[in-house]
């Protein structure tokens, strides 16, 4: 039961995390205009990975896409790449983990196969979460660098007469969404990996029993090959947990509303 709960929770946490990574990637507020002393502005600028927007005092918002690919900063391209890799890995991880869920029965899939799929999806979630956290952190670092650079050159002009106030940008909501989502995906991945350990069938350590048949002495290990390798369909040689006490999961062998084919 604990294994199923850990796996299910890991899946749900990862699902929320990946949804958050997708949301963060699509959001326009990766960087927002720093308002310093002034909480109200007539023109408010904010930028995302794909477009920059301007909101006027009337509420009118105008967004312009970054229609160039080569003209964009390498760091922005790197952040885009990291976020997309995170989403792709996360999506594949979700797909794999659906089939790996212990509460879902697909044909006669063995626990060992589910364990391998759970581990695979867990690793994918971990990498996905790390990609998102890395992407957001790279962008945040870029913002901090630019913030202090623009603060140093806050006012430039002709003899102090004409001033050009440089727009400074600070952390937008998408960064926080990305960090939290990346963290959730990472946690979900770790939970999947922990669940995998509980799912993996361990070698049953029965003592070999000798059978004497027609003069030949052959030693058999009951269920040895099929149970340990996961090949074939052998429901009789199911792994026994807790020194012979079967879990609720194993008792429920009849079809239920939670079973999917």
């Amino acid at each position: 039961m604990a294994v199923t709960a850990c796996q299910g929770l890991g899946f749900v946490v990862s699902l929320i995390g990946i949804a958050g990574i997708i949301a963060a990637t699509c959001m326009d507020q990766w960087s927002t205009q720093d308002l310093y002393n002034n909480p109200v502005t007539a023109v408010f600028n904010y930028q995302g990975l794909w477009r920059s927007c301007v909101r006027e005092s009337s509420g009118f918002t105008e967004c312009r896409g970054y229609f160039t690919l080569l003209g964009l900063p390498a760091m922005l391209q790197a952040v885009r790449a990291l976020m997309i890799v995170g989403i792709v890995l996360g999506a594949i991880g979700l797909l794999v983990s659906i089939f790996a869920l212990k509460c879902i029965r697909i044909g006669s899939m063995e626990d060992s196969a589910k364990a391998n799929m759970t581990l695979t999806s867990g690793i994918m979630f971990i990498v996905s979460g790390l990609c998102a956290i890395a992407g957001v952190s790279v962008f945040a670092n870029m913002l901090v660098t630019n913030f202090w650079m623009s603060t140093a050159n806050m006012y430039t002009g002709m003899g102090g007469m004409v001033q050009t106030v440089q727009t400074r940008y600070t952390f937008g909501a998408a960064l926080f969404v990305g960090w939290v989502a990346g963290g959730l995906t990472l946690i979900g991945g770790v939970m999947m990996c922990i669940a995998c350990r509980g799912l993996a069938p361990e070698e049953t350590n029965y003592k070999a029993v000798s059978y004497h048949a027609s003069g030949h002495s052959v030693a058999y290990k009951p269920g040895g090959f099929k149970a340990s390798t996961g090949f074939g369909s052998n429901t009789k040689n199911k792994k026994i947990y807790d020194g012979g006490a079967r879990t609720e999961d194993e008792v429920q062998s009849y079809p239920s509303k939670h079973d999917y084919v």
């Epitope: 502005t41 007539a42 023109v43 920059s52 301007v54 009337s58 050009t164 727009t167």
Partner: antibody
Amino acid sequence: QVQLVQSGAEVKKPGASVKVSCKASGYTFTDYLMLWVRQAHGQSLEWMGNINPYYGRTYYALKFQGRVTMTVDRSTSTVYMELSSLRSEDTAVYYCARDGYSLRNAMDYWGQGTLVTVSS
Amino acid sequence: DIVMTQSPYSLAVSLGERATINCKSSQSLFNSGNQKNYLAWYQQKPGQPPKLLIYGASTRESGVPDRFTGSGSGTDFTLTISSLQAEDVAVYYCQNAHSYPYTFGQGTKVEIK
């Protein structure tokens, strides 16, 4: 058509308060910011502040903060501007103006103006 | 606060001639986010409220004759009346629409010579 109709001229004594109304018609009242601008005789225009009729949120020019109050009555599509502690230099024509949505913060429609005279 | 300085203070031009009004801001009115300038031009005739002519430094408001042209970027802007008509006699104001508090130029009075 869009119309902003303001209340009539007022004569006030120094230290008193004045409340000017501006009734909007011909458009969705809550969709546009309303601004107040004043103009002393023979002088330039001076922005006093604005109000968002949808939320009732206000933003005042630092010069008028503490003395000006802008309010809204959505049921009658009317905005009000109250200026307290009047002094002689507050003698001016007070205009309400609509912030033209998508017009780069420009004011596209103006009221006819309300002359406020502060005299002892 | 952004200071708006208009020149000349008054301008006398013959009918059909070109009238040019300049406006200079103490800070740039150009917004890099959308590559737009936040400057408006208004016309005010005696006893009337101001009327919007130009917004975004160069976009003519609907119904405004095409003899009115706005140009410039950053801190220097110009309003040009290509062929002055009798009905153009008024005071013209430029407005900073980029930053609060919104500020106006002192006005330029256009008269017929």
